[in-house]
Amino acid sequence: FNMDTRKPRVIPGSRTAFFGYTVQQHDISGNKWLVVGAPLETNGYQKTGDVYKCPVIHGNCTKLNLGRVTLSNVSERKDNMRLGLSLATNPKDNSFLACSPLWSHECGSSYYTTGMCSRVNSNFRFSKTVAPALQRCQTYMDIVIVLDGSNSIYPWVEVQHFLINILKKFYIGPGQIQVGVVQYGEDVVHEFHLNDYRSVKDVVEAASHIEQRGGTETRTAFGIEFARSEAFQKGGRKGAKKVMIVITDGESHDSPDLEKVIQQSERDNVTRYAVAVLGYYNRRGINPETFLNEIKYIASDPDDKHFFNVTDEAALKDIVDALGDRIFSLEGTNKNETSFGLEMSQTGFSSHVVEDGVLLGAVGAYDWNGAVLKETSAGKVIPLRESYLKEFPEELKNHGAYLGYTVTSVVSSRQGRVYVAGAPRFNHTGKVILFTMHNNRSLTIHQAMRGQQIGSYFGSEITSVDIDGDGVTDVLLVGAPMYFNEGRERGKVYVYELRQNLFVYNGTLKDSHSYQNARFGSSIASVRDLNQDSYNDVVVGAPLEDNHAGAIYIFHGFRGSILKTPKQRITASELATGLQYFGCSIHGQLDLNEDGLIDLAVGALGNAVILWSRPVVQINASLHFEPS
């Protein structure tokens, strides 16, 4: 109707990076920008994704290099993390959130795709990492190896080999395992502290240089106490699981101290593995019973999990795997390992700013049934799996509903702010829920809408619209972009209007009647009044229309509802040649060129497009006859 299609500003970017996947208009003290997500952008050797700031009138885009942001104390994997897959602007302070839902970190032998977001302040400076689903690894362990280096240990090289082999099994790195080694005989010395080395390679290198210090006495109690009171303190981390591995070849010369030493270790929650090396006993034909009892006493209970004995130093290599496996069986403690909580949550797949924080969709949470998490300045709210059961029953738990594929919120005069989330795969047809979140990790689900058609992806896009700008939501639009009709993926947008406290179905928006795939409803944007009639409007993207060139549809708001017939359809081919997937993202909240009219930003594959609004001239015709 009044969007200019003759002089769009087409901002080019990388197609391979999918520059344009998300777009947001941005205002910094009067200067207008587009923030553009490029979730496949490369940073160095990694395809991290990134976000660009683009001036709206002329000039080139600048990469914000958010892909370089690193989290300390985790072993991160940023490759393919899809930074920029979701963007959410906070109009209050003009900060925005850029999410990397496939950001993952190493935990033992697994990579956990918890996702994370970067908060960027109004002047495009990174300010904070938001990662509510990030949990400590079960391999967050401080391991101190207590090595008997007394004279009777022979040959030392076998002990060294054992040490190196066991270290190679450890997942050493930030947020995972730290290893320290002490050696004892008559005295105890730190060979290296817990925080001296940060990789397996470095620890192994250090261990290969440990020499036998000797000693006529074997003061095992002293060695254990030294490890407990000193080694775990120097470089030890708060909250890390404390593990001690004691390797000795004979009865201790200070065994009367063991009772108190072990009591103190228990008090400090040190899990003790103890290895009895029987070489000295076997070489001399001595009965090792007393020695074995002592080592069992040192080992944590139960002995069958924590106690090992080997015939001689050379046989140490035979227990490397078993010892490693026992230590890492601590990973699964009290967990049903066939089930995922937040480990694969992909938090930030969608995002939405609310008054007190940000809502983040986590499609992979709870075995891909999904969840919505909330991060506030006061902390985070992570609803329990059980809180969704009312609408996501147990019997469908293996279906992967993908709740959190999109998140938004509505405001009703009675209930205030209510959150909305889509689960496009729920029971194959899709579902949308309206809910409030509580600090005790429960939810109150107020309403649910279900999709009609299997595979339609109902709920993959949701937008709330305040038509008259009174602060109360009038219309909720739900996209089902894969809706199949007349032999094609046509797409459908469902309209729900607020009546008292419920949203009531009120038909669908009309698209154009073409015989190709369209995916109408892939993106739905509530935009400020485009046609100057004082009602806010809606723009819907159909990025597969016109043989994947894409198109957008403009629907006008009117008296608390939305007119279901589009007032303007803009195809990519009208604007520029070579545009593809035009309409994959849309944002229209700002006047970008200072003409007093709201302008549109539309994403495409490798491009961001700005469409300028034109003024609407109201002509009131009146006939005047003379003589009357």
């Epitope: 008559e186 006495e217 003061r219 109690a221 002293f222 106490e225 009865e251 201790s252 010369h253 200070d254 065994s255 009367p256 101290d257 063991l258 009772e259 108190k260 072990i262 007393t290 009892n293 002592e294 006493y297």
Partner: antibody
Framework: EVQLVESGGGLVQPGGSLRLSCAAS????????IHWVRQAPGKGLEWVAS????????YYADSVKGRFTISADTSKNTAYLQMNSLRAEDTAVYYC?????????????WGQGTLVTVSS | DIQMTQSPSSLSASVGDRVTITCRAS??????VAWYQQKPGKAPKLLIY???SLYSGVPSRFSGSRSGTDFTLTISSLQPEDFATYYC???????????FGQGTKVEIK
């Protein structure tokens, strides 16, 4: 030659204090444990307290807990038994003895004993 | 705490007799049991350690054995210098708490 020599015994009034010493020679106190054992007139042996000179861990018999304190000074190769709030039933000959790994945790060397008499 | 019950409390025997003294532990203990000999006015002397090992310098007529929670000191042929009081002693494992038996006085018949 291994030797343990006790000193510090004597007559003390009930409620009084005494400090016994056990001077060790011929071995290093640091690698052993010292026990104090007492024997009341005409009675059997009663274990009193022990110390690991190396770690300073201590153990006490219930009858003396809170009143007696065992300590060691490895630089002087001497162990001590500080006895406070003495009672008539603490009257005994007090022996110190060595306890270590090489005697399989038996008391292999004993001092000659020092007599403590608690009487008004 | 483990109690060591020693029996008999006294016995009369002649030179050349075989003498047996028993200590019973109140609960299962390690083999860290020792036997001492004490003569009037003297400090005790170690005879047996680890239940059955003869301490150096101790005549071989002295021996020790264990059966479950029962520990036995045997003097195979009593000599005049053996008339004394004998004590068993148990060491609590992994601590330096020790317990003595009540003693057995061996007198000349």
């Amino acid at each position: 030659e291994v030797q343990l020599v006790e000193s510090g015994g004597g007559l003390v009034q009930p409620g009084g204090s005494l400090r016994l010493s056990c001077a060790a020679s011929g071995f290093n106190l640091d690698s052993s444990y010292i026990h104090w054992v007492r024997q009341a007139p005409g009675k059997g042996l009663e274990w009193v307290a022990s110390i690991s000179s190396h770690s300073s861990y201590t153990y006490y018999a219930d009858s003396v807990k809170g009143r007696f304190t065992i300590s060691a000074d490895t630089s002087k190769n001497t162990a001590y038994l500080q006895m406070n709030s003495l009672r008539a039933e603490d009257t005994a000959v007090y022996y110190c003895a060595r306890y270590w790994y090489y005697s399989a945790w038996a008391l292999d060397y004993w001092g000659q004993g020092t007599l403590v008499t608690v009487s008004s | 705490d483990i109690q060591m019950t020693q029996s008999p409390s006294s016995l009369s025997a002649s030179v050349g007799d075989r003498v047996t003294i028993t200590c019973r532990a109140s609960q299962s203990v390690s083999s860290a049991v020792a036997w001492y000999q004490q003569k009037p006015g003297k400090a005790p002397k170690l005879l047996i350690y680890s239940a059955s090992s003869l301490y150096s310098g101790v005549p071989s007529r002295f021996s020790g054995s264990r059966s479950g929670t029962d520990f036995t000191l045997t003097i195979s042929s009593l000599q005049p210098e053996d008339f004394a009081t004998y004590y068993c002693q148990q060491s609590a494992p992994y601590s330096s708490l020790i317990t003595f038996g009540q003693g057995t006085k061996v007198e000349i018949k």
